[in-house]
Interface confidence: low
């Protein structure tokens, strides 16, 4: 005979009064058996769908519907997806430092701008927040054995640069 | 007692449109999802989606997005689905149920609709 | 998804036996399992739900055992009622998934 809610199973109930296991309600759920109550399952509903369903031993977990992600805890919120030139942090959308650029839409990271530099080239066209710097062509770069003559050319104030 | 009670058979072409419904009664509606459910002899029973008759809000399964459209109206305490650009693989029978003893089960459902497509 | 593989297709048992449908899931549910019987030309009714817990109204003939993956549904004494078609059904995951069905006949 049972006289303790020591062995109920996860999903029941019981009370101490009435030592007997008694299985949850609708929409209610124990992860821990023996407790005098079972917990109220979460509603994902609004802007939250259903990730998991809730079931007697489990609650519901809920994603965001399209176009919004989680925040806090257990996605205990939705807010809308970053826009390029943003990134999603744990305080939500920011927009991306200086000298940093995000192309995309909903996800990704802020990522530093191309250092044209490093490729010999220019800074063709600046980055934004939303875009990356473009670079040009490669610059000249000249050995020491290479002899430059200037000559004018064309009137007054013309020049070209002739690498012999 | 619960009851939710469905349309009648429906016979379309291809490519309209066919809308049934399923009123429900014996319990507060919207205390519980109204789910739809498809059965074929080839494919058996596959989910279709729910719709939160509270909010109104609806969710899909992926393979029905675009082709099924749920709606309530809490007056009527009525659901409806759409079915839309109909082709001959949506003949089958329609069944609403209700969301079960706990979320995610179906502890009541309707009688079913069977709709057939053909030219 | 997840996959529900119920076995066997089709199943024909005499009056008093003993008869078992498996359900194996492609990952594990946690017990978040459902048993539906479908009566021929009628909508499915609930069974059994959580994997063993009986709904309202059903025979105690019918029990439901399981865990991890494989879950089965048992009927202790066929009677003549019991000619149906059985579905199983997860709902650990979105979307909820069934079964392909066993039919039970009466030899």
């Known amino acids: 005979v049972q006289n303790s809610c020591d062995n109920c199973q996860p999903g029941t109930f019981c009370r101490k009064y009435n030592p007997v296991c008694k299985s949850c309600p609708p929409s209610t759920f124990s992860s821990i058996g023996g407790q005098p109550n079972c917990n109220i399952c979460r509603v994902c509903a609004g802007y939250f769908r259903f990730k998991k369903f809730c079931s007697s031993t489990h609650n519901a977990e809920c994603e965001c519907i399209e176009g919004f992600h989680c925040l806090g805890p257990q996605c205990t919120r939705c807010e809308k997806d970053c826009r390029p030139g943003q990134e999603l942090t744990k305080q939500g959308c920011k927009t991306c430092s200086l000298g940093t650029f995000n192309d995309q839409n909903g996800t990704g990271v802020c990522r530093p701008w191309t250092n044209c530099s490093l490729d010999g080239r220019s800074v063709l066209k600046t980055g934004t927040t939303e875009k990356d710097v473009v670079c040009g062509p490669p610059v000249v770069s000249f050995s020491p054995s290479t002899t430059i003559s200037v000559t004018p050319e064309g009137g007054p104030g013309g020049h070209s640069l002739q690498v012999l | 007692q619960v009851q939710l009670q469905q349309s009648g058979a429906e016979l379309a072409k291809p490519g309209s449109s066919v809308k049934i419904s399923c009123k429900a009664s014996g319990y507060t509606l919207t205390s519980y999802y109204l789910n739809w459910i498809k059965q074929t002899t080839g494919q058996g029973l596959e989910y279709i989606g729910y719709?939160?008759?509270?909010?109104?809000?609806?969710h899909y399964n992926e393979k029905f997005k675009g082709k099924a459209t749920l709606t309530v109206d809490k007056s009527s305490s009525t659901a409806f689905m759409q079915l839309s650009s109909l082709t001959p693989v949506d003949s089958a029978v329609y069944y609403c149920a209700r969301g079960g003893y706990y979320d995610g089960f179906f502890d009541y459902w309707g009688q079913g609709v069977m709709v057939t497509v053909s030219s | 998804d997840i996959q529900m593989t119920q076995s066997p297709a089709s199943l024909s048992a005499s009056l008093g036996e003993t008869v078992s449908i498996e359900c194996l899931a492609s990952?594990?549910?946690?017990?978040?399992l459902a048993w539906y019987q479908q009566k021929s030309g009628k909508s499915p009714q609930f069974l059994i739900y959580?994997?063993?817990r009986l709904q309202d109204g059903v025979p105690s003939r019918f029990s439901g055992s399981g865990s991890g993956t494989r879950y089965s549904l048992k009927i202790s004494g066929m009677q003549p009622e019991d000619e149906a078609d059985y579905f199983c059904?997860?709902?650990?995951?979105?979307?909820?998934?069934f079964g392909s069905g066993t039919k039970l006949e009466i030899k």
């Open positions: 959580a994997a063993s």
């Open positions: 059904q997860q709902s650990y995951k979105y979307p909820p998934t």
């Open positions: 990952e594990g549910i946690s017990n978040d």
């Open positions: 719709i939160d008759t509270g909010s109104g809000g609806s």
